[in-house]
């Protein structure tokens, strides 16, 4: 198992529709053809798995049907989008990248992106 550097932005603010996007970039030492990306969330002294996808280089990331994540890849960058976020989902989102094939196996963990989610204020009732 070889360690690999993974970079991601320190802070991202989710949109008013509860969507947050960030780039996860890994320093690939070789020509990986199969890559696995996992997003972890750390909050309240607990780490949980948000979503994961395995993809072949040059192909789209395929998350499970019920996943809140979508993404695209370009070279050594993965563009991740997390949707359906609420204020309670605020936390540190950590990108984990594994180069599965060909050997050797590489593994990297980013420092995390703090995603802030602010629930929109409900519109006041109109008199019109």
């Amino acid at each position: 198992c070889k360690a690999m550097h993974v970079a991601q932005p320190a802070v991202v603010l989710a949109s008013s529709r509860g969507i947050a996007s960030f780039v996860c970039e890994y320093a690939s030492p070789g020509k990986a053809t199969e890559v696995r990306v996992t997003v972890l969330r750390q909050a309240d002294s607990q780490v949980t798995e948000v979503c994961a996808a395995t993809y072949m280089m040059g192909n789209e990331l395929t998350f499970l049907d019920d996943s809140i994540c979508t993404g695209t890849s370009s070279g050594n960058q993965v563009n991740l989008t997390i949707q359906g976020l609420r204020a309670m989902d605020t936390g540190l989102y950590i990108c984990k990248v594994e180069l599965m094939y060909p050997p050797p196996y590489y593994l990297g963990i980013g420092n995390g992106t703090q995603i802030y989610v602010i629930d929109p204020e409900p519109c006041p009732d109109s008199d019109f």
């Epitope: 198992c1 002294s45 780490v47 950590i94 593994l107 963990i109």
Partner: nanobody
Framework: QVQLVESGGGLVQAGGSLRLSCAAS????????MGWFRQAPGMEREFVAS????????YVPNSVKGRFTISRDNAKNTVYLQMNTLKPEDTAVYYC???????????????????WGQGTLVTVSS
Amino acid sequence: QVQLVESGGGLVQAGGSLRLSCAASGRTFSSYAMGWFRQAPGMEREFVASIRWSDNTTYVPNSVKGRFTISRDNAKNTVYLQMNTLKPEDTAVYYCATGPTRLSFYSGNYRTYDSWGQGTLVTVSS
């Protein structure tokens, strides 16, 4: 070097509970995290939980989330794995291990852990 001794395994009926213990001694201060793994016959070692020494932050993967919890007693230098609603597929040898780096804690990959206990067998009957 760190010495790890697991205990608490045994035979339990499906739906039952067990609490495994891992007593650590030696240079535990040099470890970043402690993890629990399991290995069924013919299978690769599987990650089931980790806890970070510095602040007791825990990581339990989705495969056992809601059923397994990891905790620690600082005074006893012991880490626990509480396993509830056990299923026959939870049958395995359970190992605790020390992880020297941040990578160990977050990765859930057994190859990033260095010191291992001898394991304790958990058998869940249907």
